[in-house]
């Protein structure tokens, strides 16, 4: 209708990076920009994804290098994290959120794909990380090894081998295990502190240089107390699980202190593993009963999990695996290991800014049934798995509904702001829920809409539209881009209109009648009034139309609803040659060229396209007869 197709601004980018997957218009003190997501962008050797800022009129795009943002205190894996897969602008302060839903971090032998987002302020500076699903690893441990180095230990090299082998089993790194070693006999010394080394390689190297310090006495209580009061303090981390491994070959010369020392360790929640080396006793034919009782007393309860004894120093190698396994069985404490909570949540798969924070879709949460998390300045709200049971029953828990594939919100005059989320795989047909979130981690689900067709991906795209700009939502549009019709993936957009408190189904938007795949409804954008009739409008993308070249459809708003027939269909081929997947993302909230008209930004594979609005001339014809 009034979108100019003759002089678009086609901004080129990398096709392999999928530059254009997401687009957002951006305003900084009157300067207009396009923010473009490229979720497969490479940074160094890693395919992290990234975000570009592109000037609207002329000039080249600049990479924001958000892929270089690192989280401290985690062993992160940024390769394939898909930064820019979702973008959400905050019109209040012109900041935006760029998400990396496949950002993952190492926890023990696993990688947890919790996802994370970067908040970027209005002048394109990174301001903070948003990662509500990020939890401490179960391997967030401070381990202090308390080594008896008294004269009776022989040969020392066997103790060293044990130390090196056990260290190789530890997941040492930021957010995971730290190791410190103290050696004792008559005195106690730090061999190295908890925070001295940050990798297995470095710790093993340091351990290989520990020499036996000797001593005629074995002051085990002193060694344990030194570890508790000093070694865990120097470089110890708040909230880390404290683990102590005591290795000794004889009764302590300070056993009357053990009661108090162990009480204090208990008070500090130090889990103690104790290894009795019986070499000295066996070499001299001494009964080790008193010694073994002492070591069992030192070990945390139950003994069968925390106490070890070996015939001699050489046999230490035989307990390496068992000791390692027992320490890491702490990972599974109070946990059903066959089930995932937020570990694979992929938070930030979708994002939406609300007044008090941001909603993040987490499709992988709760065994890929999905969830919606909220991050606010006051903290985060993570609804419990049980909160969703009303609409996502237990019997369908293994279906992978992907709730949070898309998130948005609506405003009703009665209920205020209500959140909306899509679950395109729910029971194979898809579902959309409208809900409010509570700080006690529960939800109130007000309404649910279900898809009609298996595999249609109903709810993979949702947009709310305030047609008349009165602050109350009039229409909710739900895309089912894989809707199969007439032998093709045609796609469908369902229209729901707000009647009192409920959204009522009111037909579908019409697409064109081509006989190829289209995926109409892959993207749906509520845009500000394009045709200057004072009603806000809607643009729908069909990126597979015209043999994957893509097309967009413009639908006009009218009197609290949406006209279901498109006023304009713009195909990629009209605009430029070689465009592909045009319409995969759409945004239209700003006048980009200062002509008083709202312009459109449309993403394509390797391109971002700006379409300029043209003025609409209203001609009012009137007939005047003379003489009357």
């Amino acid at each position: 209708f009034n979108m100019d197709t003759r002089k678009p601004r086609v901004i080129p980018g990398s096709r392999t990076a999928f530059f254009g997957y997401t687009v957002q218009q951006h305003d900084i003190s009157g300067n207009k920009w396009l923010v473009v997501g490229a979720p497969l962008e490479t940074n160094g050797y890693q395919k992290t994804g990234d975000v570009y800022k592109c000037p609207v009129i002329h000039g080249n795009c600049t990479k924001l290098n958000l892929g270089r943002v690192t989280l401290s205190n985690v062993s992160e894996r940024k390769d394939n994290m898909r930064l820019g897969l979702s973008l959400a602008t905050n019109p209040k302060d012109n900041s935006f959120l760029a998400c990396s839903p496949l950002w993952s971090h190492e926890c023990g032998s696993s990688y947890y794909t919790t996802g994370m987002c970067s908040r970027v302020n209005s002048n394109f500076r990174f301001s903070k990380t948003v990662a509500p699903a990020l939890q401490r690893c179960q391997t967030y441990m401070d381990i202090v090894i308390v080594l008896d180095g008294s004269n009776s230990i022989y040969p020392w090299v066997e103790v060293q081998h044990f130390l090196i082998n056990i260290l190789k089993k530890f997941y040492i790194g930021p957010g995971q295990i730290q190791v410190g070693v103290v050696q004792y006999g008559e005195d106690v010394v730090h061999e190295f502190h908890l925070n001295d080394y940050r990798s297995v390689k470095d710790v093993v190297e340091a351990a290989s240089h520990i020499e036996q310090r000797g001593g005629t006495e074995t002051r085990t209580a002193f060694g344990i107390e030194f570890a508790r009061s000093e070694a865990f303090q120097k470089g110890g981390r708040k909230g880390a699980k404290k683990v102590m491994i005591v290795i000794t070959d004889g009764e302590s010369h300070d056993s009357p202190d053990l009661e108090k020392v162990i009480q204090q360790s208990e008070r500090d929640n130090v889990t103690r593993y104790a290894v009795a080396v019986l070499g000295y006793y066996n070499r001299r034919g001494i009964n080790p009963e008193t010694f073994l009782n002492e070591i069992k007393y030192i070990a945390s309860d139950p003994d069968d999990k925390h106490f070890f004894n070996v015939t001699d120093e050489a046999a230490l190698k035989d307990i390496v695996d068992a000791l390692g396994d027992r320490i890491f069985s702490l990972e599974g404490t109070n946990k059903n290991e066959t089930s995932f909570g937020l570990e694979m949540s992929q938070t930030g798969f979708s994002s939406h800014v609300v007044e008090d924070g941001v909603l993040l879709g987490a499709v992988g949460a709760y065994d890929w049934n999905g969830a919606v998390l909220k991050e606010t300045s006051a903290g985060k709200v993570i609804p419990l798995r049980e909160s969703y049971l009303k609409e996502f029953p237990e019997e369908l828990k293994n279906h992978g509904a992907y709730l949070g594939y898309t998130v948005t919100s609506v405003v009703s005059s009665r209920q205020g702001r209500v959140y909306v989320a899509g679950a395109p795989r729910f029971n194979h047909t898809g579902k959309v829920i409208l809900f409010t979130m509570h700080n006690n981690r529960s939800l109130t689900i007000h309404q649910a809409m279900r898809g009609q067709q298996i595999g249609s991906y109903f709810g993979s795209e949702i947009t709310s539209v305030d047609i008349d700009g009165d602050g109350v939502t009039d229409v909710l549009l739900v895309g089912a881009p894989m809707y199969f019709n007439e032998g093709r993936e045609r796609g469908k957009v369902y229209v729901y209109e707000l009647r009192q408190n409920l959204f009522v189904y009111n037909g579908t938007l019409k697409d064109s009648h081509s006989y190829q795949n289209a995926r109409f409804g892959s993207s749906i954008a509520s845009v500000r009034d394009l045709n200057q009739d004072s009603y806000n409008d809607v643009v729908v993308g069909a990126p597979l139309e015209d043999n994957h070249a893509g097309a967009i459809y413009i639908f006009h708003g009218f009197r609290g609803s949406i006209l279901k027939t498109p006023k304009q269909r713009i195909t990629a081929s009209e605009l430029a040659t070689g465009l592909q997947y045009f319409g995969c993302s759409i945004h239209g909230q700003l006048d980009l060229n200062e002509d008083g008209l709202i312009d459109l930004a449309v993403g394509a594979l390797g391109n971002a396209v700006i379409l300029w609005s043209r003025p609409v001339v209203q001609i009012n014809a009137s007939l005047h007869f003379e003489p009357s």
Epitope: F222, E251, D254, P256, D257, K260, T290, Y297
Partner: antibody, heavy 120, light 109 residues
Framework: EVQLVESGGGLVQPGGSLRLSCAAS????????IHWVRQAPGKGLEWVAS????????YYADSVKGRFTISADTSKNTAYLQMNSLRAEDTAVYYC?????????????WGQGTLVTVSS | DIQMTQSPSSLSASVGDRVTITCRAS??????VAWYQQKPGKAPKLLIY???SLYSGVPSRFSGSRSGTDFTLTISSLQPEDFATYYC???????????FGQGTKVEIK
């Protein structure tokens, strides 16, 4: 030769205070445990208190808890028993003794004792 | 707290007699039980440690044994210098708390 010598005993009024000393020689107090044991006239042995000199951990019998304080000065190789709020029933000969790993946690060396009399 | 009940409280014996003194612990304890000899006006002397080990310099007629919670001091052949009061003492494991028995006075018959 290991030796323990107590001093500081004497006559004191009820409610009064006294400080007993136990000077050790022939071994290092730093790596030892010292116990105080008392014996009321014509009665048996009663354990009073103990200290681990290097860790400063202390233990007390219920009868003296809150009134007596055991301490050690390793530089002087001497242990002390500060006795406050003394009562008539605290009248006894007070012995200090070494508690040793080498005798499987028995009191292997004792001092000669010092008499404390609490009377008005 | 563990109580050590010593019996008898006194006994009369003749030189050459075999004398047995028993201490019963109120609950199961470790073998950290010692026996002491005390003569009037003197400090106690260690005889037996770890229930059955003879302390250095102590004559071999003294011996100790354990049976469950019962600990026994035996003087195989009483000598004139053995007339004294004998005490058992138990050490609480892994602490410095100790308990004495009430004592057994061995007198000349």
């Amino acid at each position: 030769e290991v030796q323990l010598v107590e001093s500081g005993g004497g006559l004191v009024q009820p409610g009064g205070s006294l400080r007993l000393s136990c000077a050790a020689s022939g071994f290092n107090l730093y790596s030892s445990y010292i116990h105080w044991v008392r014996q009321a006239p014509g009665k048996g042995l009663e354990w009073v208190a103990s200290i681990s000199s290097y860790s400063s951990y202390t233990y007390y019998a219920d009868s003296v808890k809150g009134r007596f304080t055991i301490s050690a000065d390793t530089s002087k190789n001497t242990a002390y028993l500060q006795m406050n709020s003394l009562r008539a029933e605290d009248t006894a000969v007070y012995y200090c003794a070494r508690y040793s790993y080498y005798s499987a946690w028995a009191l292997d060396y004792w001092g000669q004792g010092t008499l404390v009399t609490v009377s008005s | 707290d563990i109580q050590m009940t010593q019996s008898p409280s006194s006994l009369s014996a003749s030189v050459g007699d075999r004398v047995t003194i028993t201490c019963r612990a109120s609950q199961s304890v470790s073998s950290a039980v010692a026996w002491y000899q005390q003569k009037p006006g003197k400090a106690p002397k260690l005889l037996i440690y770890s229930a059955s080990s003879l302390y250095s310099g102590v004559p071999s007629r003294f011996s100790g044994s354990r049976s469950g919670t019962d600990f026994t001091l035996t003087i195989s052949s009483l000598q004139p210098e053995d007339f004294a009061t004998y005490y058992c003492q138990q050490s609480a494991p892994y602490s410095s708390l100790i308990t004495f028995g009430q004592g057994t006075k061995v007198e000349i018959k």
